[in-house]
């Protein structure tokens, strides 16, 4: 049982508009055009978007207007395909446009590039930024929306017309001050940072829709929402989790309109229905639509029910255990992922789904036996290395982060990943780490009960990104194996992997290692960037270099980055000491 | 495993229709979607229509909509796909497809995990 309304309507177009309401529509609209068309610029697509919008509201006045029955894939496909020069700008993705729907709408799913060859959305000066916002907050705003979803194709929608939102109150608040740097940066940083584990994670969402379809989003959902909500029942659950469910799928779709209508109608039905959920909603269930939805998707865990009987009784010891599970297989299974998620809510997502499929396991090979019982009666034990192996990745990851800090960090798993899989290439290899390493900021700060979920999630859905670059050109052997399998055994498959033996050295290019006077003027970020493309390369040249070697070549790097920096004449500090340098690492990696 | 059997396939003029029913059996498995998709000798297998499980939302191909539809019997785990208005150009062998997982893409034929033989249909002029 769903809560979307499922009448028909004459106009699809002319629905969706008065539903979400012209600013919204009008935003959604530029998301998928935007998502879809990545190369496109933002006034090729706000031409567009005007178009259908003035469409839409011809459709609102009659919906037997002329092609107002049209679906919207139909309607949108067909304007993105009476762009000019598509083939020129687009390639292969111009051939979706010989396609019938919905066969086309599928075609340009495919084409969305997870990597588009697009240069940094580099912020403005303050001053140039409260400028063109006084001037026309809806363009600026627009601006918002088509370079951070051109970037980011599968970002979630209607998430991202609320960091739109955020975005503009900031803004507002902002630009009426007398520093307007201090207090921007900060906020729009934490804006930014937030959006930018929002995209991975709804990225991963969309990869489990893709590679293993719904049903595997539902256990997804089903672990996450017991987690939160200890309290509703079983049926409740399935509910959320079905209407979820399809929310994302319209979104991986590209269907963005329903995506957020149908995210609204949910929250909608949440808010009504917070007795039979959750008691912590209210908060949220008091903002407006956007908040409201952002604020109900992070909500805090309800307190758990003080008299829950242990999960040993139902699932172990009740002698109906076989019977239960053949009569309906994926229900029971279903009831087991409940009953273990809302029981602890301080283990991951991945893990829960983990020993649900060790619990399926073990079921299928028992309950074929002569004393099933007997067979079945330790899976509980069973569950104890699955669960201390993530358990003690956090431990080392955090003890780790703690002593060397962020970008210390960042640079350990560098070196990790790159003898793991140094056939990828270096920029990848970086991004991979720098994102890893933020999970020491963003986890390892937390209560010890969240560390677990908030860890192996995020890692789950970085590497998830990692995968998705490496299907494009793949390299190693060991990512392939690791990507191959299913999304919650990535992780510690990824933590499994050793040194890859098969890899040949590369020779070592003194040009590499070769840095000029402009690097003094780089901003911090990317200085760490630079350095950490040096590490990575040194680290392909010798694999097996120690953790001290690697650790005196980046001293040495780093004090000489800073001697020529500091140095009046740079560029001869720096075409002097540099050769140097060169030397002094060969010797100490010999 | 899932058995997927076709039949109503066979030969009609223009303009003609024709029934096809398709009937899963095997496991019990949960059917996300049925689909049907057509394959002329040399070209690639192309989706014709296809219909979801629960919701009975359907998709068809532009070129068949309005003269095509697709319907289920969820207790008799059947399909059909009721062809009406035939013309030449539907004439293919059609397969019709069990998608398991309810994967993201409907036309893709990698999102359907068992198929059926085959029935042909042919529409003379």
């Known amino acids: 049982r769903g809560v979307f309304r499922r009448e028909a309507h004459k106009s699809e177009i002319a629905h969706r508009y008065n539903d979400l309401g012209e600013q919204h529509f009008k935003g959604l609209v530029l998301i998928a055009f935007s998502q879809y068309l990545q190369k496109c610029s933002y006034d090729e697509h706000a031409k567009l978007v005007q178009e259908v919008t003035d469409f839409a509201k011809t459709c609102v006045a009659d919906e037997s207007a002329a092609n107002c029955d049209k679906s919207l894939h139909t309607l949108f496909g067909d304007k993105l395909c009476a762009i000019p020069n598509l083939r020129e700008n687009y390639g292969e993705l111009a051939d979706c446009c010989t396609k019938q729907e919905p066969e086309r709408n599928e075609c340009f799913l495919q084409h969305k590039d997870d990597n588009p060859s697009l240069p940094p959305f580099e912020r403005p000066e303050a001053e140039a930024m409260c400028t063109s916002f006084k001037e026309n907050p809806t363009t600026f705003m627009g601006h918002y929306l088509h370079e951070v979803a051109r970037r980011h194709p599968y970002f979630y929608a209607p998430e991202l017309l609320y960091y739109a939102e955020q975005y503009n109150e900031i803004l507002t608040q902002c630009c009426a001050e007398a520093d307007k740097e201090s207090c921007l940066t900060p906020k729009l940083d934490g804006v930014k940072e937030k959006a930018l584990v929002s995209s991975v994670r709804q990225r991963m969402k969309c990869s489990s829709m893709q590679k293993f379809g719904e049903r595997a989003f539902k256990a997804w959902a089903v672990a996450r929402l017991s987690q939160t909500f200890p309290n509703a029942d079983f049926a409740e659950i399935t509910k959320l989790a079905t209407d979820l469910t399809k929310v994302n799928k319209e979104c991986c779709h590209g269907d963005l309109l329903e995506c957020a209508d149908d995210r609204a109608e949910l929250a909608k039905y949440m808010c009504e229905n917070q007795a039979t959920i959750s008691s912590k909603l209210q908060t949220c269930c008091d903002k407006p639509l956007l908040k409201k939805a952002h604020c109900l998707s992070e909500v805090e865990h309800d307190t758990m029910p003080a008299d829950l009987p242990a999960i040993a009784a139902d699932f172990v010891e009740d002698q109906e255990v076989c019977k239960n599970y053949a009569e309906a297989k994926d229900v029971f299974l279903g009831t087991f992922l409940y009953e273990y998620s809302r029981r602890h809510p301080d283990y991951s997502v991945s893990l829960l789904l983990r020993l649900a499929k060790k619990y399926e396991a073990t079921l299928e090979k028992c309950c074929a036996e002569a004393n099933p019982p007997a067979c079945y009666g330790t899976v509980l034990a069973e569950f104890q290395p699955l669960v201390e192996e993530p358990k003690n990745l956090v431990k080392t990851n955090c003890d780790l982060y703690e002593k060397l800090g962020e970008y210390g960090f960042q640079n350990a798993i560098l070196v990790r990943y790159t003898q793991k899989a140094p056939q990828v290439s270096t920029p990848t290899l970086v991004e991979a780490a720098r994102n890893l390493g933020r999970v020491g900021t963003k986890c390892c700060t937390l209560p010890e009960d969240q560390r677990l979920p908030c860890v192996e999630d995020y890692l789950s859905a970085i590497l998830n990104r990692v995968c998705l670059l490496h299907e494009k050109t793949p390299v190693s052997e060991h990512v392939t194996k690791c990507c191959s399998g299913s999304l919650v055994e990535r992780r510690p498959c990824f933590s499994a992997l050793t040194v890859d033996e098969t890899y040949v050295p590369k020779e070592f290019k003194a040009e590499t290692f070769t840095f000029h006077s402009d690097i003094c003027t780089l901003p911090e970020k990317e200085k760490q960037i630079k350095k950490q493309t040096a590490l990575a390369e040194l680290v392909k040249h010798k694999p097996k270099a120690t953790a001290e070697q690697l650790k005196t070549v980046m001293d040495d790097f780093a004090q000489f980055l800073d001697t020529c920096c500091k140095a009046a004449d740079k560029d001869t500090c720096f075409s002097t000491e540099g050769p140097n340098l060169v030397t002094r690492c060969k010797d100490a990696l010999a | 495993q899932v058995q997927l059997v076709e039949f109503g396939g066979g030969l009609v003029q223009a303009g003609d229709s024709l029934r096809l029913s398709c009937a899963a059996s095997?496991?019990?498995?949960?059917?996300?979607?049925m689909a049907w998709f057509r394959q002329v000798p040399g070209k690639e297998r192309e989706f014709v229509a296809a219909i979801s499980w629960s919701g009975g939302t359907t998709r068809y191909i532009d070129s068949v909509k309005g003269r095509f539809t697709l319907s289920r019997d969820n207790t008799k785990n059947m399909v059909y796909l009721q062809m009406n208005s035939l013309k030449p150009d539907d004439t293919a062998v059609y397969y019709c497809?069990?998608?398991?997982?309810?994967?993201?893409?409907?036309?893709?034929?990698?999102?359907?995990?068992?198929w059926g033989q085959g029935t042909q249909v042919t529409v003379s002029s």
């Open positions: 497809a069990v998608d398991s997982s309810g994967r993201l893409y409907w036309t893709l034929s990698t999102s359907y995990d068992y």
């Open positions: 095997g496991r019990s498995l949960g059917i996300y979607k």
